[in-house]
Structures are given as structure tokens and as C-alpha cells.
Interface confidence: low
């Protein structure tokens, strides 16, 4: 059955209640230079409009503080109102390493990110940090790597490993949950000139992730005791016509091309899904596509296999799919899939269908295919036009969390966290935020607060209290380090 009655029950005490933000652009300088500059200035407002130092006058200074960054104050105010236990945000690789290698490290950017993490910890909010978050408009790569063919160039994977190592070294004492790459399975939207470009870029992204995981596993895990994975875009697929076999096959094929493409090599075999490889090969043989999945060497399979500590899924909606034979040598046509927009379904302004039961089906599919592992939903949300009373978002959150709870209570899926997407919206973008672009709170915040404080949807008389030891204590030493380690 698709929809089942709501359940009453609670998530475990160590469940991560999170909110996700995309790339945080680091502020280059703290907003309060007067605290570190002992000189007094007067502003020549009517003349040359410059600041002129007053000679012979020295002011008391104080060390720079994290809260001198205006952005951080804003972030913290929003996070405090969200009452979350975890905050997922992404670093800007291009800001941290403008040259793409370790020859020019932007220490100020790293200090900014360290401040975001450490100030969050003071509020009891742990960070899940994403190292690389490409967006469709912008690849987010350092300029030199972009000009050297980006992810089509295998050396970008080596550069990523060095960047990851730097971040683990600089932030790993405070950060215990890492995402290497956000939605590498959606980079097909950018590397779409040909299927071979798409599969080649994907291969290099897989290698980049695995190199970073291996580096962490050996060099940093013994002392930092953290966990590393990558976030896959993981929408569920249903046959548009449940009575058509070809539609069922198309739905499974969608999941193979979308999720298994990355999950199979990392979680299971070290190689691409046989179903995907065979489907592309059969189209190749029939002259319908010249695409081919890369052949992996034994060393590459060794490198990829098992390089995840947990499963991280970004789930937004369910797609209704049907089979349609498509000619052409691109990833989209290799799949032979057509999407159907079901106008009878509740949908968002950007046509995202609200299909709560899809997330439960997804979680069961992942467990069935990849075993009983810890799963985090690292982004889940909907766009809602309302600037104050965002009812669609409240409905979405309530219903999707209900299905996640069913997966936990009934299906015994090891779900460890849910990260709502996203903290604040950006100007002229679909409205996914809990806060407007000018930081005004929406009413869905109170709804999410209530779910968090209740740990789900408890029975009337059940306690939502957790003892200190049961709560999410993944970073007990972090607060100590925040105080002791210079920022």
C-alpha cells in the first residue's frame, strides 16, 4: 500500500535533527576592525571621503572573535531559533584553495569556517560539513582546475584529496560528520555533452570521494573518530502506469541509473551496477547510443569498494516514470525514461510532487540492496511561495517525517538523522528556506521545533526526555577544544 495511517512514536535519543544550507561563502574580514586596530580615525565626509588617522591616539584593542563576522551572527540567530541538533553546510573549495592546490591556502576562509563550527557547538549544534557542493549554475571548482577540464581530468580527484586532507586537518577536531561531495549523481546536468563525458566525470568524482575517504580512514580517523560519506540525490521512482511491466522496469532502471550508479561501487562491489552496464551495452550494440561505462581496473575496484561510513541521501520527491526508447548518446537518453507530471498530486510551485510514502519505499530499497547500514537523510524539503505561513512546507515536513518514522519503527531501518532543506532562501531562487532571504522566520520553524522537542509524534503520555548519555554526544570533546584551540 502507498499511504498508510499515521503512526505514533518517537525517534531514538541520538537521532540527528538537522537543517541543511548550501555553500557558505566565507567573509574575508571580520566586521569589526576597530577591535584589532589600535588607531583612531576620522572620516573626511565632505572632502575626499577618506579615513584619516588621528596621530598620537591609541585605543584599547581586543583579540578578534568569531562573532565579529556579521554572517556568523546571522547564522547563529537562525540556528538557535531552529532548535536543531545538527547543521549541515558546505565549504567553498574555490575560496579555501584558490589555486586548486596547497600552494596558496586561504587561512582566513578556514578560520571563518572554524568559527561557524565552534560557535555552533557553543549552542549545542554539531556540524555536518560538506567539502564540495557543486550547483547547476556553477561547478564550484577552483579556477585552475576548471580550466584544466574540471572533472573530466583525473588529476582533479588528486587535487580533491589534498583539499579534503587540509579540511580534515583544520576542522576535524570539531567536525565528526563529513560529506565529501554533494549529489555527484546530478553532475550529469552539467557534463551532458555526451554520455561518455557524464560517465567519465562521474568516474573521477567516485575516485575523488574514495581517495578522500581512504585518507581520512587512515590518517585522521584514529584521532578524530569521525565518519565520512557522500550525499546522493535519491528521489524515488514509481511506474506511471502500475499495470504496465515496461513502466515497472523503467522505475527500477531510474533507480539504477540515479542511485546505484554511485552506491553500487562504493557500498557493494567496487564496480558499476551490472543492470546499468548491460543496458548501455545493449543500446550500444543496437546502434542507439555510443556511450560506454568506464571499465574499472582491479586497483580502482579496490579503491572504491567500502568507502562509506554511512549512507547519505537527499530526498525531495517521487518521480512517475515510463519507458520510452530514446536515441542519442547522452546520459538522459541512455536511460530510456520519460517522466510524467501527475497533475492530480499536491505539488509545489516548481512542480515537486508531495509524495510522502516515496521516502519510506526509498529507505527500504536502499536497505534491501545495500544492507543494514546507518542512513541519514541529508536534505529533504519543498519550495513554498508563502513568506510567512508556509503551510505546504509544514504539511511536507509532517508527512515525510511520518514516513521516516514508519521506516524506523515498523521496517527497522537504521535511520540516524533527518536534515530539512534549507535554512535560508536565496534571492530569486525557489523558496526552500525556513527563513526568507532577509532573515525573516516562517511559521514552519515552530512546527519543526515541536517535532524535534517531541522526538517525533509521541503518544499523549509518553516522555520525550532523554538522559544526557543517550543524547547525541558525538562531539563531547569538541566544546573543550573550542575553548582551548586558538581560532
Amino acid at each position: 500500500k502507498e499511504s498508510t495511517p499515521d503512526v505514533q512514536g518517537q525517534f531514538p535519543c541520538d537521532f540527528s535533527w538537522g537543517v541543511t544550507e548550501s555553500v557558505l561563502k566565507p567573509e574575508s574580514v571580520a566586521s569589526s576592525p576597530q577591535f584589532s586596530d589600535p588607531h583612531l580615525y576620522v572620516w573626511n565626509a565632505t572632502g575626499n571621503r577618506l579615513l584619516h588617522r588621528v596621530e598620537g591616539v591609541r585605543l584599547k584593542t581586543r583579540p578578534a572573535q568569531c562573532t565579529d563576522f556579521v554572517n556568523i551572527k546571522k547564522q547563529l540567530e537562525m540556528l538557535a531559533r531552529m532548535k536543531v541538533t545538527h547543521y549541515r553546510f558546505a565549504l567553498d573549495w574555490a575560496s579555501v584553495l584558490p589555486t586548486g592546490n596547497l600552494s596558496a591556502v586561504n587561512r582566513q576562509a578556514l578560520r571563518y569556517y572554524r568559527c561557524v563550527v565552534s560557535e555552533g557547538l557553543k549552542l549545542g549544534i554539531s556540524a555536518m560539513v560538506t567539502l564540495y557542493y557543486p550547483t547547476h549554475a556553477h561547478l564550484g571548482l577552483p579556477e585552475p582546475l576548471l580550466h584544466a577540464d574540471g572533472w573530466l581530468n583525473p588529476s582533479t580527484a588528486e587535487a580533491f584529496q589534498a583539499y579534503a586532507g587540509l579540511c580534515f586537518q583544520e576542522l576535524g577536531d570539531l567536525v565528526k560528520l563529513w560529506i565529501t561531495i554533494n549529489e555527484p549523481n546530478r553532475l550529469s546536468d552539467i557534463y551532458n555533452r555526451s554520455g561518455n563525458d557524464t560517465y567519465g566525470a562521474a568516474h573521477n568524482l567516485l575516485v575523488a570521494h574514495a581517495l578522500a575517504w581512504r585518507l581520512y580512514d587512515r590518517q585522521f580517523r584514529p584521532s578524530q573518530r569521525g565518519a565520512v560519506s557522500l550525499s546522493l540525490h535519491a528521489d524515488w521512482a514509481e511506474p506511471a502506469n502500475p499495470y504496465a511491466d515496461s513502466h515497472w522496469r523503467a522505475a527500477e532502471r531510474f533507480l539504477q541509473f540515479e542511485i546505484a550508479w554511485f552506491a553500487e561501487p562504493l557500498f557493494k562491489t567496487g564496480d558499476y551496477p551490472a543492470a546499468m552496464r548491460e543496458y548501455i551495452a545493449s543500446k550500444h550494440r543496437r546502434g542507439l547510443s555510443s556511450s560506454a561505462l568506464p571499465r574499472l581496473t582491479e586497483a580502482e575496484r579496490r579503491l572504491l569498494k567500502g568507502t562509506v561510513d554511512f549512507c547519505a541521501l537527499n530526498h525531495f520527491t517521487t518521480r512517475f516514470v515510463m519507458h520510452e526508447q530514446l536515441a542519442g548518446s547522452r546520459y538522459d537518453s541512455d536511460r530510456d525514461i520519460q517522466f510524467l507530471q501527475d497533475i492530480t498530486r499536491l505539488s509545489s510551485p516548481t512542480r515537486l510532487a508531495v509524495i510522502p510514502w516515496g521516502v519510506r519505499k526509498l529507505l527500504r530499497w536502499v536497505r534491501r540492496n545495500y544492507g543494514d547500514m546507518d542512513i541519514y537523510i541529508t536534505a529533504s524539503g519543498i519550495d513554498d511561495q508563502a513568506l510567512e505561513d508556509d503551510r505546504l512546507r509544514k504539511y511536507y515536513l509532517g508527512k515525510y517525517l511520518q514516513e521516516v518514522l514508519k521506516a524506523y519503527l515498523i521496517d527497522k531501518v537504521r535511520i540516524k538523522g533527518y536534515y530539512a532543506f534549507k535554512l535560508a532562501e536565496e534571492k530569486s531562487k525557489p523558496r526552500f528556506g525556513f527563513f526568507t532571504s532577509d532573515f525573516k522566520a516562517k511559521s514552519s520553524i515552530q512546527f519543526y521545533n515541536k517535532v524535534i522537542s517531541s522526538r517525533g509524534f509521541p503518544f499523549e503520555n509518553s516522555s520525550s526526555r532523554c538522559s544526557q548519555t543517550q543524547e547525541n554526544t558525538e562531539c563531547t570533546v569538541c566544546l573543550f577544544l573550542v575553548q582551548k584551540k586558538p581560532l
Epitope: 584529496q161 581512504r214 580512514d217 587512515r218 590518517q219 575496484r301 579496490r302 579503491l303 569498494k305 567500502g306
Partner: antibody
């Protein structure tokens, strides 16, 4: 916790062969290399080679090719080293040690060592 | 093969003082920003114990009096202040390329 348990001491005759074992526990056996290291009295440590139990691939120090053969049994999480055509030069303590090929490749976990004595 | 030359072959250090052991590689063991040089301590009848990995990283559970530094071809292990239990043989080990090799060892005696 991670443990590597090696087989007991061996007294063997020149020209014979010996097979020593290293049983791993506390981690996923197929995910990490098992290295073998030789230590002779009054001398330093020598790396013999590694086996990756995930696919049974091996790498040897040229000096030990033909002398040492590394194998692994996934079902029992045990790695083996066979030494053939033994001479007094092969009398030593042999250690197994775990490393991660794509990490730093240092050896964190070691077996207790197996003493092999070659004597007529 | 990369030859690792350790010096001195032996040294005696008073309790509480500093012990410095150096290791020189016949060619660089540094690549992609990491130096694949490690240090081990071995006591009689025991397997070696990893102290420092990747030139300067302290292995979990190892006292902070052990430290490592260096890159390229020259590396040092420092122990300060030396304690009674530090009497042992110390080896450097590179894993930059195959075959991996070890230094000849330095025997540390406590006066």
C-alpha cells in the same frame, strides 16, 4: 578491537617449507592489506610483501619473490605466508601487520610474531 | 629501493632529557603534500609499535612527548622528556613506493 593472532614457533629442516598464519579479528578482513615483515636477531626489519584479501592481489619485495608466497582465506579471516627452500638465512621472527593501501600505508596493528628456526 | 639511513645507531640519554633520532632517505618519500615516513618503537620480544605516521602525526594513544618532523629526504624523531619506559629500538619506515623499507634502527638507552 583489531587483533592479529599468529601461529606458534616452528622448527624446520633446511630445504623444507613452512606455512605460518595470521588470524584477523575486529575489522572487515577484506578491506585492508596484510603485510609481512621479517626481523632477524641483531638486524633491522625487512618488508616481505602484502596481500589484499578483498581480491587476493599481492605485492612482493623483489628480494623475497620465489621465497615467500602470500595467501588469504576470507572465510576464516586468516592470512598465510609460506616460505620455501629454507636456509639458516630464513631463521627469523616473522610479523604480520595491517595497513590501508590508499591511506598512509603505515602499520598500526601487528601480530605477536612467529619464530621460525631453520636447523638440521 | 629507497635506502633509509638512521643515526645514531645507539644513544644514551639521561632521564628527562631530549633524544633525537634522524633518518635520511636516499630519495624523497614525499608526494601529493604528504611525507610517507613513519616511526616505530620495538622492545625485545614484542612487535613494533607505531608512534608517528606521515612524518609528524602522533598515533592515537602515544604520549605527546614523542614528535616527528621533516619532509622530502630528512626526518627526525624527538622524545622529550625521555622516560624510563622509552628504552627500546626505534625504526623509521617509508611507504612512499614499493618496496617499503625500514631504517637500520637506533637503540635508545636511558642513563
Amino acid at each position: 578491537q583489531v587483533q592479529l593472532q599468529q601461529s606458534g614457533p616452528e622448527l624446520v629442516k633446511p630445504g623444507a617449507l613452512v606455512k605460518i598464519s595470521c588470524k584477523a579479528s575486529g575489522y572487515t578482513f577484506t578491506r585492508y592489506d596484510i603485510n609481512w615483515v621479517k626481523k632477524r636477531p641483531g638486524q633491522g626489519l625487512e618488508w616481505i610483501g602484502w596481500i589484499y584479501p578483498g581480491d587476493d592481489s599481492t605485492k612482493y619485495n623483489e628480494k623475497f619473490k620465489g621465497k615467500a608466497t602470500l595467501t588469504a582465506d576470507k572465510s576464516s579471516s586468516t592470512a598465510y605466508m609460506q616460505l620455501s627452500s629454507l636456509t639458516s638465512e630464513n631463521s627469523a621472527v616473522y610479523f604480520c601487520a595491517r595497513s590501508d593501501y590508499y591511506g598512509s600505508r603505515s602499520f598500526v596493528y601487528w601480530g605477536q610474531g612467529t619464530l621460525v628456526t631453520v636447523s638440521a | 629501493d629507497i635506502l633509509l639511513t638512521q643515526s645514531p645507531a645507539s644513544l644514551a640519554v639521561s632521564l628527562g632529557q631530549r633524544a633525537t633520532i634522524s633518518c635520511r632517505a636516499s630519495k624523497s618519500v614525499s608526494t601529493s603534500g604528504y611525507s610517507y615516513m613513519h616511526w616505530y618503537q620495538q622492545k625485545p620480544g614484542q612487535p613494533p609499535k607505531l608512534l608517528i605516521y606521515l612524518a609528524s602525526n602522533l598515533e592515537s594513544g602515544v604520549p605527546a612527548r614523542f614528535s616527528g618532523r621533516g619532509s622530502g629526504t630528512d626526518f627526525t624523531l624527538n622524545i622529550h622528556p625521555v622516560e624510563e619506559e622509552d628504552a627500546a629500538t626505534y625504526y623509521c619506515h617509508h611507504s612512499g613506493e614499493l618496496p617499503y623499507t625500514f631504517g637500520g634502527g637506533t637503540k635508545l638507552e636511558i642513563k
